[in-house]
């Protein structure tokens, strides 16, 4: 502890100019004081001034008022510093002396004489309030005040609590009157050494080194570090934990860069045709009548649908067509006949049946012939039965579809997986991707088809955690961790409640 006992001398009265021994001072009592402060004694005794002692210069002659003076000789109040815990009790001896000698250092003069002395014993709490007192004897009167205050940086009822205001690495605070700490704005903690981060800064994902800051931990971003960073290269996906790539609707693949909904995203089918998705970047356009081509972008001739019946010839007109009917037929499509079975209207061995009491007829055609009069050889390709750009070919009584690579089925309606051909060697796993199959190789193999045996095994160091399976070869000089249920991350290091939908590339 550390503090100061302060004694303020106010007035001394010695009207007759007398010494304690009854003699008078000539020409007057040139008065100075000796003060002795010590531990509490029920009966004051001579001996060391255990709490300190001080002397004044000559302050006046006989009777005088003592003015406050804060520097130089004759300082008032008098200061008695101590470097211990203030016990709360004390004994004080104030002696008034006459000196015939030096005004400034009367202590050293010979022939000094005692005028009077007073003794105070009691308790005194630390505080700023002065305790005022007055002591009289038969010859003199002394008025004075005293108090105990703590030294700078010391606090508490016994001046034992050290507190020094601080604004550095290990504290940012001021001291309260009781010595407790009061944190400066922006700081917290018992010792005010912890910065208060930017309001809203995520407790786990962000931190700060100074107030109103928010520094993100790896895998997090944003002003408040509450946004996860998705897997590097993630195109059309999001994350709920760092390095994830959960695909948006209509996207697939490791980096969500494969378009599973090409129809919606690109609208490739023209002229009101219907678009059907068929795998990554795959689609089929079903054309309305009068259109053809992969995207139904080609307008057919108005006569292409052979609208003229009964051997009528079709002639294109602007936005329409016109049928030139053969003899015996009439109507917009030559659908009405003026002929009867008697006119032998059925060709190619067709049988004639009379209708409407012989006023009209109908031909029943043999196989491979069609038309009102069996005049047309059947072309089974006219209905464009082959999907996905397949070529239709007539084969006698039937027709076949010659499919483009990657499609199969009677009408080329089925998309063949590139993986169906098992292109991956050495037990590699095949993935259908936009630009062809990609193989995920087992440990020890690499290359596009896992055909290369590698001497340095990227999986040898066991980079995958939580029981994940390690593969190499998905990308050059690299490995893939295929996470078990409940884990994600490039090395399957993050636990989650949901199963990963695909392996993570490290």
């Amino acid at each position: 502890g550390s503090g100061i006992f302060q004694l303020r001398l106010q007035e001394f009265v010695n009207q007759r100019g007398m010494l304690a021994n009854g003699q008078s001072c000539e020409p007057g009592c040139r008065t100075f004081f000796r003060i002795c402060l010590k531990h509490f004694q029920a009966t004051f005794s001579e001996g060391p001034c255990t709490f300190g002692n001080v002397s004044t210069p000559v302050l006046g002659t006989n009777s005088f008022v003592v003015r406050d003076k804060n520097s130089g000789s004759g300082r008032n109040p008098l200061q008695l510093p101590f470097n211990f815990t203030w016990p709360g009790t004390f004994s004080l001896n104030i002696q008034a002396w006459h000196t015939p000698g030096d005004d400034l250092r009367p202590e050293t003069s010979p022939g000094n004489s005692l005028i009077s002395q007073i003794i105070i014993q009691g308790s005194l709490a630390v505080g700023k309030i002065w305790r005022t007192d007055e002591q009289n004897d038969t010859l003199t009167r002394l008025s004075y005040s005293y108090r105990v205050i703590c030294s700078d940086n010391y606090y508490g009822e016994s001046c034992s609590r050290l507190c020094k205001k601080r604004d550095d690495h290990f504290g940012h605070y001021e001291c309260q009157p009781d010595g407790s700490l009061s944190c400066l704005p922006g700081w917290t903690g018992k010792y005010c050494d912890q910065p208060i981060c930017l309001s809203g800064c995520h407790e786990q994902n962000g931190y700060c080194s100074k107030p109103d800051e928010c520094i993100c931990r790896p895998g997090w971003q944003g002003r408040l570090c509450n946004e996860c960073i998705p897997h590097n290269g993630c195109r059309h996906g999001t994350c709920s934990i760092p390095w994830q790539c959960a695909c948006d609707e209509g996207w697939g693949g490791l980096f969500c860069d494969q378009d599973l909904n090409y129809c919606t995203h690109h609208s490739p089918c023209k002229n009101g045709s219907t678009c059907s998705n068929s795998g990554p970047k795959g689609y089929t356009c079903t054309c309305l009548p009068g259109y053809t081509g992969e995207h139904c972008e080609l307008g057919l001739s108005k006569c292409a649908s052979n609208p003229c019946r009964n051997g009528g010839s079709c002639k294109d007109q602007e936005n329409s067509y016109h049928c030139l009917c053969p003899p015996g037929y009439y109507g917009q499509h030559c659908e009405h006949s003026t002929l009867t079975c008697a006119d032998s209207p059925c060709f190619n061995g067709g049988s004639c049946r009379e209708r409407n009491q012989g006023s009209s007829y109908a031909c029943e055609c043999p196989p491979n012939f069609t038309g009102s009069n069996c005049e047309k050889k059947v072309d089974r390709c006219t209905s464009n039965p082959c999907a996905n750009g397949g070529q239709c070919q007539n084969r006698g009584p039937s027709r076949t579809c010659r499919c483009r690579p990657g499609f199969t089925g009677t009408h080329c309606e089925l998309h063949i997986s590139d993986c169906a051909r098992s292109p991956c060697a050495h037990g590699g796993t095949c993935h259908d991707l936009e630009n062809g199959p990609v193989c995920t190789c087992p440990a020890g193999f690499s290359g596009r088809r896992c055909e290369v045996r590698i001497t340095h095994d990227a999986c040898a160091s066991g980079p995958c955690f939580n029981g994940a399976t390690c593969y190499t070869g998905l990308s050059p000089n690299n490995f893939v961790c295929n996470c078990p249920y409940g884990f994600v991350g490039s090395r399957c290091e993050f636990p989650v409640g949901l199963p990963p939908s695909f392996p993570w590339v490290a």
Epitope: K164, D168, H169, F170, G171, G189, C208
Partner: antibody, heavy 121, light 104 residues
Framework: EVQLQESGPGLVKPSETLSLTCTVS??????????WGWIRQPPGKGLEWIGD???????YYNPSLKNRVTISVDTSKNQFSLKLSSVTAADTAVYYC?????????????WGQGTLVTVSS | SYELTQPPSVSVSPGQTASITCSGE??????VSWYQQKPGQSPVLVIY???KRPSGIPERFSGSNSGDTATLTISGTQAMDEADYYC?????????FGSGTKVT
Amino acid sequence: EVQLQESGPGLVKPSETLSLTCTVSGGSISSSGYYWGWIRQPPGKGLEWIGDIYYTGNTYYNPSLKNRVTISVDTSKNQFSLKLSSVTAADTAVYYCAREEVILGGGADQWGQGTLVTVSS
Amino acid sequence: SYELTQPPSVSVSPGQTASITCSGESLGDKYVSWYQQKPGQSPVLVIYEDSKRPSGIPERFSGSNSGDTATLTISGTQAMDEADYYCQAWDGETGVFGSGTKVT
């Protein structure tokens, strides 16, 4: 009682990066109230404070070294590390790790035994 | 940058009092720690927050700090106290050590 142990290469080539690790035993590096610091002492010279870190990741560096130094903490391993890049012969020193205690006003009450790092080609 | 200055050496007879000073601008406004370092050993904290002794440090070690000067006092110096002594303070977020004083 907490003990600290420095580890790392004793020889580093000029312009390379010096890397040291301090392993804390007998106590958790995640305890609040402690900063974990690095101090160095060139042969025959005085002590120089390099920087320190709090378990939450807050780092503080000596301005004279700030653009070359990185201190990091790995609470799972109870370790903290020092990286000093682009070293020169002037970085040859005994490197100490220490625990600075908040309740001691920042006094470092526990020190490692120190490891001598020589920068030479 | 903030600097702390110490005398290079202080000589003292056994049983006498050794005083080591540490000077810096307005140092009394800062808390000062003192470290003892014997040859080939790591430093040991002997005084923190100007005048407080960690447990295990003998009572003969005391400290004070006011104005521009902090002082480490070793009263009744013993042969085992022969060592280098460093003062240390915090300037903002940066630790600063004094140049060191050899006590013989």
